[in-house]
């Protein structure tokens, strides 16, 4: 058993049929010694008396808010949550496996640049009685500070018969060094509580591996005289790290016909312009990627040929 | 070339070679063998390799003030990785395919380190750690980890040379 926060405790249980459970001793936070009784949740049934209460925690029915009283007055509370371990593996019932980039990916994170700011998100089908708390650091043995905000519900989607809820959080490394080569990964830890079930999820990554630039901005076409060719030009996104001579991007320019089946013409360039042939009803798209490290491409920025 | 007197390196040449190194490091990574072994792990090999850190002067301001600190750090890293790529980790079982980009990568690391340091002048280099793989699966794991870490190192080096070529070239 360990303390999650004041008066909230997590009991770690090996979860299998007829498991013996864990013996837990609760102590009433009071100077009083006599006349103390214990109840669980809203029930008025007295579970025991005395300053301490010993219980065998085996299942969710044994978890909940234990309260000690004296003469009708509440002295203190202890909320017991359960953390299930099945066959040596902690349960992951609350969050959905996003399966990208690999199985058992519950948290996904992205950064728009090297400033040390990043966003993480996760999915669940649970709509009520759900709380999240997020902590983060750079490294784990001698952790350096990363500050995270509160997790918020950022999207709701219908997936078949189910509703899916997306939560996200923004974090910022306290003393980021954008030009350095990271040697210690960022650790993100999410505590999830649903009713009386506790679970924790972690992700470990380097900012360089979660970089995804915003799409190029100001995408423009300039027809070339007496030619089907056009000069496409664009600019670095505002959110990208500066100076651009140091934090350089590379670009992919694509000409795509109206039909998805039509052959796509692609050009790769380090410049912020390119000359392509503009077909009727086609569109021109440009996306960006870090020039020197193959993290994610940005989403496409597009303009119609006409 | 970065010479003892502190004159400038051939920024444009270094830029071109460091960008080639980036490409090679990424093309070598998937080709060192099939790999399901978790690339995480509670102990990181990357603790044993030289990193371009915050105080090494490789940021744009540091390069403007005095690029020598940064260039020395890059040189140290290039020599270190060049030794690793020539070690038993890459030459032992399982054998790399004859056309593996690791050979080219090895040669290019040496090429860039020579551009930075002419004969006769020696910056101190770091000892290569004893990672002591005794099994082929351990060598394979180390190859992946070393190449991942090399990709990060050469990316910073390439940024340094690109910025130098754009802003510090005579």
């Amino acid at each position: 058993i360990w303390e999650l926060k004041k008066d909230v405790y997590v009991v770690e249980l090996d979860w299998y049929p007829d498991a013996p459970g864990e013996m837990v001793v609760l102590t009433c936070d009071t100077p009083e010694e006599d006349g103390i009784t214990w109840t669980l949740d809203q029930s008025s049934e007295v579970l025991g008396s005395g300053k301490t209460l010993t219980i065998q925690v085996k299942e969710f029915g044994d978890a909940g808010q234990y309260t000690c009283h004296k003469g009708g007055e509440v002295l203190s509370h202890s909320l017991l949550l359960l953390h299930k371990k099945e066959d040596g593996i902690w349960s992951t019932d609350i969050l959905k496996d996003q399966k990208e980039p690999k199985n058992k990916t519950f948290l996904r994170c992205e950064a728009k640049n090297y400033s040390g700011r990043f966003t993480c998100w996760w999915l669940t089908t649970i709509s009520t009685d759900l709380t999240f708390s997020v902590k983060s650091s750079r490294g784990s043995s001698d952790p350096q500070g990363v500050t995270c905000g509160a997790a918020t519900l950022s999207a709701e989607r219908v997936r078949g018969d189910n509703k899916e809820y997306e939560y996200s959080v923004e974090c910022q490394e306290d003393s980021a060094c954008p030009a350095a080569e990271e040697s210690l990964p960022i650790e993100v830890m999410v505590d999830a509580v649903h009713k009386l079930k506790y679970e924790n999820y972690t992700s470990s990554f380097f900012i360089r591996d979660i970089i995804k630039p915003d799409p190029p901005k100001n995408l423009q076409l300039k027809p070339l005289k007496n030619s089907r060719q056009v000069e496409v030009s664009w600019e670095y996104p505002d959110t990208w790290s500066t100076p651009h001579s140091y934090f350089s991007l590379t670009f992919c320019v694509q000409v795509q016909g109206k039909s998805k089946r039509e052959k796509k013409d692609r050009v790769f360039t380090d410049k912020t312009s390119a000359t392509v042939i503009c077909r009727k009803n086609a569109s021109i798209s440009v996306r960006a990627q870090d020039r020197y490290y193959s993290s994610s491409w940005s989403e496409w920025a597009s303009v119609p040929c006409s | 070339r970065a010479v003892p007197g502190g004159s400038s390196p051939a920024w444009t040449q270094c830029q071109q070679l460091s960008q080639k190194l980036c490409t090679l490091a990424w093309s070598a990574h998937p080709l060192v063998g099939h790999m399901d072994l978790r690339e995480e792990g509670d102990e990181e090999t990357t603790n044993d390799v030289p990193h371009i850190q915050c105080g090494d002067g490789c940021d744009p301001q540091g390069l403007r003030d005095n690029s020598q600190f940064c260039l020395q750090r890059i040189h140290q890293g290039l020599i270190f990785y060049e030794k690793l790529l020539g070690s038993d980790i890459f030459t032992g079982e399982p054998s790399l395919l004859p056309d593996s980009p690791v050979g080219q990568l090895h040669a290019s690391l040496l090429g860039l380190s020579q551009l930075l340091q002419p004969e006769g002048h020696h910056w101190e280099t770091q000892q290569i750690p004893s990672l002591s793989p005794s099994q082929p699966w351990q060598r394979l794991l180390l190859r992946f980890k070393i190449l991942r870490s090399l990709q990060a190192f050469v990316a910073v080096a390439a940024r340094v040379f690109a910025h130098g070529a754009a802003t510090l070239s005579p």
Epitope: - | H34, D36, D42, E93, P94, S95, Q135, P136, Q138
Partner: antibody, heavy 121, light 111 residues
Framework: EVTLKESGPVLVKPTETLTLTCTVS????????ISWIRQPPGKALEWLGV???????NYNSGIKSRLTISKDNSKSQVVLTMTNMDPVDTATYYC???????????????WGQGTTVTVSS | DIVLTQSPDSLAVSLGERATINCRAS??????????MHWFQQKPGQPPKLLIY???NLESGIPDRFSGSGSRTDFTLTISSLQAEDVAVYYC?????????FGGGTKVEIK
């Protein structure tokens, strides 16, 4: 289908040399390592040695001086030679494929049926 | 050599009940976070069969009532609901250092 089959004498006299051949099919010896493992009657398993994809070998130091493992990739055969046999070497000898280096980390995914060798005069 | 000590030597479990076998290594069998510990099942007159590789990965074709956990020196094989066909001897094996070594085996029977 992956198969490994051991062949060789079932009876060997003390001080003689044992030669066992492992013939494999369904995969190439240039892609997978082969180990030899033995099991005395009613006892646990003992690893004898391995021949890697490139032809290099590692042996159990306890019997290294008596062992040689070689292979012929084109014939898909691996040969174990063990000199100076003794009655304590009586065991079932298995030829075993080591799983893909990058996934299995030294786990042995396919085993031959084994051949029982008795050392007796 | 790395010595692997299995416990218990034998185990009698009722059908449908849980069976747990432990394997302790005399030194860590982890290499940069990868546990080179594997589990095998051997039935009488048959060669061993790979069940679990790298401590916790289920070999293809093996029922998911078998699971493995642990790292460094302490490892566990669990059969969540014992079936009649699970009666066998179970061995752990390490491949972190030469020579590869096996545990002494745990015999699982039906109570």
């Amino acid at each position: 289908e992956v198969t490994l089959k051991e062949s060789g004498p079932v009876l060997v006299k003390p001080t003689e040399t044992l030669t066992l051949t492992c013939t494999v099919s369904g995969f190439s010896l240039t892609s997978y390592a082969i180990s030899w493992i033995r099991q005395p009657p009613g006892k646990a398993l003992e690893w004898l040695g391995v021949i890697w994809t490139g032809g290099g070998t590692n042996y159990n130091s306890g019997i290294k001086s008596r062992l040689t493992i070689s292979k012929d990739n084109s014939k898909s055969q691996v040969v174990l030679t063990m000199t100076n046999m003794d009655p304590v070497d009586t065991a079932t000898y298995y030829c075993v494929r080591e799983g893909d280096y990058g996934s299995y980390a030294g786990a042995m995914d396919y085993w031959g049926q084994g051949t029982t060798v008795t050392v007796s005069s | 050599d790395i010595v692997l000590t299995q416990s218990p030597d034998s185990l009698a479990v009722s059908l449908g009940e849980r069976a747990t076998i432990n394997c302790r290594a005399s030194e860590s069998v982890d290499y940069y976070g990868i546990s080179s510990m594997h589990w095998f099942q051997q039935k009488p007159g048959q060669p061993p069969k790979l069940l679990i590789y790298r401590a916790s990965n289920l070999e293809s074709g093996i029922p998911d009532r078998f699971s493995g956990s642990g790292s460094r020196t302490d490892f566990t094989l669990t059969i969540s609901s014992l079936q009649a066909e699970d009666v066998a001897v179970y061995y752990c094996q390490q491949a972190n250092k030469d020579p590869y070594t096996f545990g002494g085996g745990t015999k699982v029977e039906i109570k």
